[in-house]
């Protein structure tokens, strides 16, 4: 027997239902009460999902798991796991048995968007050219860790002076906090990029500091 | 008929070194995962360590990894066990058994057994 | 890991007792859970497997039910050769842990 699976990993979003594909060929004749089919997790070797004896015996993962039944005979012993949740992130190996054997092993990604980043300014009043500024970029619940990038109003990258931190709460999503530190010019708008590199999503936010008006201080 | 027949126990001292060899028939052995199951004087059972069919995954209980290797040949249809450092507590039958299926792990219980070899690590 | 814990630890029962041995788990192991037979001097002898399944050549007074957490090996009518120690084994997970043993012993 030849088990198959998909080459790419399978991305699945947080608290979405995933399918990781698995088909085998049976031969004509060929009956469920042959059929071993188990799915462990790669590296551990625990135990997720299992089909044996002529009979599916359930989940043995968290019992978000589950085969479709109806499909088993045609040669599909692909797993649907539901809710998915960032630790279920990771290899997953399906292995059926019919007279001989073979398994394939299927990566699944996990991915969470990022929110629209809200930005934050320190000093918020009383804004001088030439005064240095904290311009904070916060953006949550999501998952990889993100990506950020700072320019200014030109489009012109801004490198120096970012700090970005990057925290996973209980759910293992990440708030990302990116600080920019800026002397200000006569006006400026500043955009904050946070990129989640798997879903390739992008989100935005800026701030323009437009001065009351800005103007720069009279020479002695 | 399934048979299992470990051989290379005996005694040694600690911090000696051993090789159990379990020879297997009556089954297509490079079809099943194998594994080593002990036990000490009067005690209960304890996985030691499993092996896949094609040796590509190998697992160890806690208390003798890094001092235990388990290979297998299939051309042989023999298992082994390299037992390294051994300690007082390592005294036990040493169980070669048949894993049901190819791989080893979640759902891959063991079917048949061998008769065991006794190890003995004493000074 | 998962610990795996049988009661009682000994009986003592007459042939053609009714006999029950339970074992519990500290999580889940589905249904991948396994009772072995050891007599004095010799190897585990495999009777259940996938919780209910009867192993080829054990007689059918054996059988065993439960889910989860919990499970009972029970041998209907006993025989003057099923006086021996018995385990519980899960395989749901390495590393494979067993029940600490029954010891079913003659009244």
């Known amino acids: 027997v030849e088990v198959q699976v998909s080459e790419d990993p399978v991305v699945a979003l947080v608290d979405t239902d995933a399918t990781l594909r698995c088909s085998f060929s049976p031969e004509p004749g060929f009956s469920l009460a042959q059929l071993n089919l188990i799915w462990q997790l790669t590296d551990t070797k625990q135990l997720v999902h299992s089909f044996t004896e002529g009979r599916d015996q359930g989940s043995a993962y968290s019992n978000r798991t589950a085969l479709f039944p109806d499909l088993l005979v045609q040669g599909n012993a692909s797993l649907r796991l539901q809710r998915v949740r960032v630790t279920d992130e990771g290899s997953y190996t399906c292995f059926v048995s019919i007279q001989d054997f073979d398994s394939a092993a299927v990566s699944l990604q996990v991915a969470a968007p990022y929110s629209k980043p809200s930005m934050t300014l320190e000093p918020n009043k009383d804004l001088r050219p030439g005064n240095m500024v904290t311009i904070t970029c916060s953006s949550y619940q999501g998952y990889p860790e993100a990506e950020v990038f700072w320019k200014d109003g030109q489009g012109v990258p801004l490198t120096g002076n970012v700090t970005t931190s990057q925290m996973a709460n209980e759910r293992g999503l990440f708030d990302v906090h990116s600080v920019l530190r800026v002397v200000l010019g006569a006006n400026g708008t500043y955009s904050c990029l946070v990129r989640n590199p798997v879903l390739q999503q992008d989100a935005h936010g800026s701030v323009t500091i437009t001065g009351q008006p800005l103007t720069f201080p009279p020479e002695a | 008929e399934v048979q299992l027949v470990e051989s290379g126990g005996g005694l040694v001292q600690p911090g000696g070194s051993l090789r159990l060899s379990c020879a297997a028939s009556g089954f297509t052995f490079s079809d099943y995962g194998m594994g080593w199951v002990r036990q000490a004087p009067g005690k209960g059972l304890e996985w030691v360590s499993s092996?896949?069919?094609?040796?590509?995954?190998?697992e160890y209980a806690d208390s003798v990894k890094g001092r235990f290797t388990i290979s297998r040949d299939n051309s042989k249809n023999t298992l082994y066990l390299q037992m390294n450092s051994l300690r007082a507590e390592d005294t036990a039958v040493y169980y070669c058994?048949?894993?049901?299926?190819?791989?080893?792990?979640?759902?891959?219980?063991?079917?048949?057994w061998g008769q065991g070899t006794l190890v003995t690590v004493s000074s | 890991d998962i610990q795996m814990t049988q009661s009682p630890s000994s009986l003592s029962a007459s042939v053609g007792d009714r006999v029950t041995i339970t074992c519990r788990a500290s999580q889940s192991v589905s249904s991948h859970l396994a009772w072995y037979q050891q007599k004095p001097g010799k190897a585990p002898k495999l009777l259940i497997y996938l919780t209910s399944s009867l192993q080829s050549g054990v007689p059918s007074r054996f059988s065993g039910s439960g889910s989860g957490t919990d499970f009972t090996l029970t041998i209907s009518s006993l025989q003057p050769e099923d006086f021996a120690t018995y385990y519980c084994m899960q395989s749901k997970s390495l590393p494979f842990t067993f029940g600490q043993g029954t010891k079913v012993e003659i009244k």
């Open positions: 092996i896949s069919w094609d040796s590509s995954s190998k």
């Open positions: 058994a048949r894993a049901w299926i190819a791989i080893i792990g979640g759902g891959a219980h063991f079917d048949y």
